[in-house]
């Protein structure tokens, strides 16, 4: 990657981070009456998430994420869940590249939507701070 492509990658990661934080803030909103129900849904967590290729694991969980977000009141988000997830999907596909043979491996234990989002927020923050 060139310095310009790395800069683009950094910007895409920042967009991804903001989108994930927006979702987390939306579902954690004290006015969200569906939060208890949303927390019953389980998400697969990556066995490891340190590099861009590990975004394969996030991509595979975007559909379930959209389904859970559809439960939330739409006023908690600036965009409809479908559009929000579509935006994230575009970023993820660009970031992880076209290494189609890379298969995700998942951790043994599943997680709530809050734990899932926090994991990918931590991932985004760490890549932003270490990508050179």
């Amino acid at each position: 990657p060139t310095s310009s492509s790395t800069k683009k990658t950094q910007l895409q990661l920042e967009h991804l981070l903001l989108d994930l934080q927006m979702i987390l803030n939306g579902i954690n909103n004290y006015k969200n009456p569906k939060l208890t129900r949303m927390l019953t849904f389980k998400f697969y967590m990556p066995k490891k998430a340190t590099e861009l290729k590990h975004l394969q694991c996030l991509e595979e969980e975007l559909k379930p994420l959209e389904e859970v977000l559809n439960l939330a009141q739409s006023k908690n988000f600036h965009l409809r869940p479908r559009d929000l997830i579509s935006n994230i999907n575009v970023i993820v596909l660009e970031l992880k590249g076209s290494e189609t043979t890379f298969m995700c491996e998942y951790a043994d234990e599943t997680a709530t939507i809050v734990e899932f989002l926090n994991r990918w927020i931590t991932f985004s923050q760490s890549i932003i701070s270490t990508l050179t």
Partner: antibody, heavy 117, light 107 residues
């Protein structure tokens, strides 16, 4: 059998440069993330840099802007270009393979870098 | 960055003893923890991954456990060849960080 063999270490003056190499064999080099980890005399281990299979590079604040990790998949080789060296960069530098889903599973024997005037 | 606090920094054991080394992460790292053995004058060797899984060829005397923030490596029936320094490492996020190490001395 997986093998990682480092070379290029030596004595260099503060402010100087050095390029370390790591020759890999026994695995599909291009599919793995590779890392450099260092160990100062009598001290613990410190992660210095990593480069993934797409050649994206990662490093901590301590070396960013001074050290550059790179790879040549055709030669099954990993490199660490070290510039603006300081006394605190004195250490044994290890090349390690980062398994896709687990820890640093194979390590080289190390090469010693001494920064001193 | 995630800090890995390892204790004790050194310990002494007799052949046949059972010893435990602990590592505490400054934040949740799931089970993304590895343990390494470094014998005098040698490079580190991977012992344990995912907190509790032994690498191929590692004797079953070495047992890793823990999740979240608290981890341990237990060596049962210590042998003279276990004389080494042991390090924990988190690979939950970059930058990877290591514990300060534990030197195991054989009496």
């Amino acid at each position: 059998e997986v093998q990682l063999v480092e070379s290029g270490g030596g004595l260099v003056q503060p402010g100087g440069s050095l390029r370390l190499s790591c020759a890999a064999s026994g695995f599909t080099f291009s599919s793995y993330t590779l890392a450099w980890v260092r160990q100062a005399p009598g001290k613990g281990l410190e992660w210095v840099a990593a480069i993934d299979s797409s050649s994206y590079t990662y490093s901590p604040d301590t070396v960013r802007g001074r050290f550059t990790i790179s790879r040549d998949n055709a030669k099954n080789s990993l490199y660490l270009q070290m510039n603006s060296l300081r006394a605190e960069d004195t250490a044994v530098y290890y090349c390690a393979r980062d398994s896709n889903w687990d820890a640093l599973d194979y390590w080289g024997q190390g090469t010693t870098v001494t920064v001193s005037s | 960055d995630i800090q890995m606090t390892q204790s004790p920094s050194s310990l002494s054991a007799s052949v046949g003893d059972r010893v435990t080394i602990t590592c505490k992460a400054s934040q949740n790292v799931g089970t993304n923890v590895g343990w390494y053995q470094q014998k005098p004058g040698q490079s580190p060797k991977a012992l344990i991954y995912s907190a509790s899984f032994r690498y191929s060829g590692v004797p079953d005397r070495f047992t890793g456990s823990g999740s979240g923030t608290d981890f341990s490596l237990t060596i049962s029936n210590v042998k003279s060849e276990d004389l080494a320094e042991y390090f924990c490492q988190q690979y939950y996020t970059y930058p990877y960080t290591f514990g300060g190490g534990t030197k195991l001395e054989i009496k």
